[in-house]
């Protein structure tokens, strides 16, 4: 058993049929010595008396808010949560496996630039009685500070018969130099509590590996005389690291109709303009990627050919 | 140590081309190592990230773009010099700051070159003959060092009398390649910045 936060404790249980469970001793936070009784949750049934209460925790029925009282007055609470371990593996029931970029990916993180700011998100099908808390650091043995905000519900989607909820959090490394060469990864730890179930999820990454620029901005077309060709120009996204001559991007320019199966024109360039062939009912799209370290491409920025 | 000598070059900033070739060569070699050594811990997640130039050179700080010298977090390790122009540029006004940056890059290359050559000598003794360093990568390191145009004491190649542990050597190769790729990215950014200056 360990303390998650004040008056909230996590009991780690090996989860299998007829498991013996874990013996837990609760102590009432009071100077009083006599006349103390214990109850669980909203029940008025007295579980025991005295300053300490010893319980055998085996299942979720044994978890919950234990309260010690004296003469009708509440003295203190201890909330017990369960963390299940099945076949040596901690449970991951609360969050959905996103399977990208690999199996068992519960947390996904992205950064728009090298400033040390990044966003992580996760998915769940659970809609109520759910709380998250996020901690982060650079390195684990001698951790350097990363400050994370509160996790918020950022999107809801319908997936077949189920509703899916996306939560996200923004974090900022306390002292980040955009030009630095990372040797210690960022560690992100998410504590998830659903009712009386506790789970924790972690992700470890270098900012350089989670870079995904915003789409290029200000796409403009200029038809070329006596030609099917069009000159398309754009600018670096505002959120990208500066100076741009140091943090350079490379671009992919594509002309395609509405269907992905349709024919297309595609060209890669390090410049902020390119010449392509425009077709009726097609769109010109441009996306960006770090020129020197190939992490993710940005989403497409598009304008219609016409 | 001699400061870099600026040789007039009417064409493109010459080091940019070499640094692009360097990054490409290192990336290819790293990819080859990851494929060939698939049963060794050779991915970014599996290896320890070591920097053989740590406390010996200060490329990131010495080559920091002017715009980032206002960022306190970029200045925490030492008095930072910033880059303005340099020997690879066709200019005779090579600043001291610039020389420091390019000299630091040169020292990085020299250190990695020695490490890679030593390692290759060991790998050539491996009866499995599983992996060797790409000669193209070694040649590209050499070309960039020549383009940087420094005179520097030659570092003797390390020789080891004991029987090499090939497993450890291959893991060290992965560690070196990952670190060198990151440094090659920095070098490319620096050269691109200089080219635009």
């Amino acid at each position: 058993i360990w303390e998650l936060k004040k008056d909230v404790y996590v009991v780690e249980l090996d989860w299998y049929p007829d498991a013996p469970g874990e013996m837990v001793v609760l102590t009432c936070d009071t100077p009083e010595e006599d006349g103390i009784t214990w109850t669980l949750d909203q029940s008025s049934e007295v579980l025991g008396s005295g300053k300490t209460l010893t319980i055998q925790v085996k299942e979720f029925g044994d978890a919950g808010q234990y309260t010690c009282h004296k003469g009708g007055e509440v003295l203190s609470h201890s909330l017990l949560l369960l963390h299940k371990k099945e076949d040596g593996i901690w449970s991951t029931d609360i969050l959905k496996d996103q399977k990208e970029p690999k199996n068992k990916t519960f947390l996904r993180c992205e950064a728009k630039n090298y400033s040390g700011r990044f966003t992580c998100w996760w998915l769940t099908t659970i809609s109520t009685d759910l709380t998250f808390s996020v901690k982060s650091s650079r390195g684990s043995s001698d951790p350097q500070g990363v400050t994370c905000g509160a996790a918020t519900l950022s999107a809801e989607r319908v997936r077949g018969d189920n509703k899916e909820y996306e939560y996200s959090v923004e974090c900022q490394e306390d002292s980040a130099c955009p030009a630095a060469e990372e040797s210690l990864p960022i560690e992100v730890m998410v504590d998830a509590v659903h009712k009386l179930k506790y789970e924790n999820y972690t992700s470890s990454f270098f900012i350089r590996d989670i870079i995904k620029p915003d789409p290029p901005k200000n796409l403009q077309l200029k038809p070329l005389k006596n030609s099917r060709q069009v000159e398309v120009s754009w600018e670096y996204p505002d959120t990208w690291s500066t100076p741009h001559s140091y943090f350079s991007l490379t671009f992919c320019v594509q002309v395609q109709g509405k269907s992905k199966r349709e024919k297309k024109d595609r060209v890669f360039t390090d410049k902020t303009s390119a010449t392509v062939i425009c077709r009726k009912n097609a769109s010109i799209s441009v996306r960006a990627q770090d020129r020197y370290y190939s992490s993710s491409w940005s989403e497409w920025a598009s304008v219609p050919c016409s | 140590r001699n400061l870099p000598v600026a040789t007039p070059d009417p064409g493109m900033f010459p080091c940019l081309h070499h640094s692009q070739n360097l990054l490409r060569a290192v990336s290819n070699m790293l990819q080859k190592a990851r494929q060939t050594l698939e049963f060794y811990p050779c991915t970014s997640e599996e290896i320890d990230h070591e920097d053989i130039t740590k406390d010996k050179t200060s490329t990131v700080e010495a080559c920091l773009p002017l715009e980032l010298t206002k960022n306190e977090s970029c200045l925490n390790s030492r008095e930072t010099s910033f880059i303005t122009n340099g020997s690879c540029l066709a200019s005779r006004k090579t600043s001291f700051m610039m020389a420091l940056c390019l000299s630091s890059i040169y020292e990085d290359l020299k250190m990695y070159q020695v490490e890679f050559k030593t390692m290759n000598a060991k790998l050539l003794m491996d009866p499995k003959r599983q992996i060797f360093l790409d000669q193209n990568m070694l040649a590209v390191i050499d070309e960039l060092m020549q383009a940087l145009n420094f005179n520097s004491e030659t570092v003797p190649q390390k020789s080891s009398l004991e029987e090499p542990d090939f497993y450890k050597t291959k893991i060290k190769l992965c560690i070196l390649l990952h670190a060198f790729r990151i440094r090659a990215v920095t070098i490319d950014r620096v050269m691109s910045y200089l080219n635009a200056s």
């Epitope: 099917r228 490379t250 024919k263 297309k264 024109d265 595609r266 890669f268 077709r279 | -």
Partner: antibody, heavy 118, light 107 residues
Framework: QVQLVQSGAEVKKPGSSVKVSCKAS????????LHWQRQAPGQGLEWMGW????????EYAPKFQGRVTITADESTSTAYMELSSLRSEDTAVYYC???????????WGQGTLVTVSS | DIVMTQSPLSLPVTPGEPASISCRAS??????LHWYQQKPGQAPRLLIY???QSISGVPSRFSGSGSGTDFTLTISSLQPEDFATYYC?????????FGQGTKVEIK
């Protein structure tokens, strides 16, 4: 399976014209760009131009501009390349090639030898 | 027009040995470069597109690398069926242009 079948070899006199055909099978004809290139005996490849069979849009290499015409007939899934004012240096194998991507070629015809000789 | 220069023009190789063909563009073309193989009396066949992207059905011993002006086609271990002429082609701008070709011959 996508295939491009070209018409047979031709022998032409200098100053005349030649029209080579390229019939496509497998896949929808208008879903692909169609290109023509040529290869003189023992020489490299030379791109001549492309057509979008969907709308008849064409683009030609400046070297052939005014001498080459590329057309397409959607009803027969056939593209044509006509080269006029032939000279001996036009002796070459002419290839059609297609792709959903405009700028490179993933399926090629077998080639048509055009010999220009007096 | 962008001029593509291949080297060497002839490459004698022992079967089973690796081979590398270089292609240089007269100006920067990013990764807009493609490689073809041509055997005598046959049409060219696409091997690699956009400098390093492999084509399904093409053996994995063929790989491409490069960007900007310098590109390489590598055959890790030459098989008898690989003796042919190889062409690079740029798609950065029209007119599309090819290298002169590199003939890989048996040593």
């Amino acid at each position: 399976q996508v295939q491009l079948v070209q018409s047979g070899a031709e022998v032409k006199k200098p100053g005349s014209s030649v029209k080579v055909s390229c019939k496509a099978s497998g896949g929808t004809f208008s879903d692909y760009y169609l290109h023509w290139q040529r290869q003189a005996p023992g020489q490299g490849l030379e791109w001549m131009g492309w057509i979008d069979p969907e709308n008849g849009d064409t683009e030609y290499a400046p070297k052939f501009q005014g001498r080459v015409t590329i057309t397409a007939d959607e009803s027969t899934s056939t593209a044509y390349m006509e080269l006029s004012s032939l000279r001996s240096e036009d002796t070459a194998v002419y290839y059609c090639a297609r792709n959903k991507e405009l700028r490179y070629f993933d399926v090629w015809g077998q080639g048509t030898l055009v010999t220009v000789s007096s | 027009d962008i001029v593509m220069t291949q080297s060497p023009l002839s490459l004698p190789v022992t079967p089973g040995e690796p081979a590398s063909i270089s292609c240089r563009a007269s100006q920067s073309i990013s990764i807009n470069l493609h490689w073809y193989q041509q055997k005598p009396g046959q049409a060219p066949r696409l091997l690699i597109y956009f400098a390093s992207q492999s084509i399904s059905g093409v053996p994995s011993r063929f790989s491409g690398s490069g960007s900007g002006t310098d590109f390489t086609l590598t055959i890790s271990s030459l098989q008898p069926e690989d003796f042919a002429t190889y062409y690079c082609q740029q798609s950065n701008s029209f007119p599309l242009t090819f290298g002169q070709g590199t003939k890989v011959e048996i040593k």
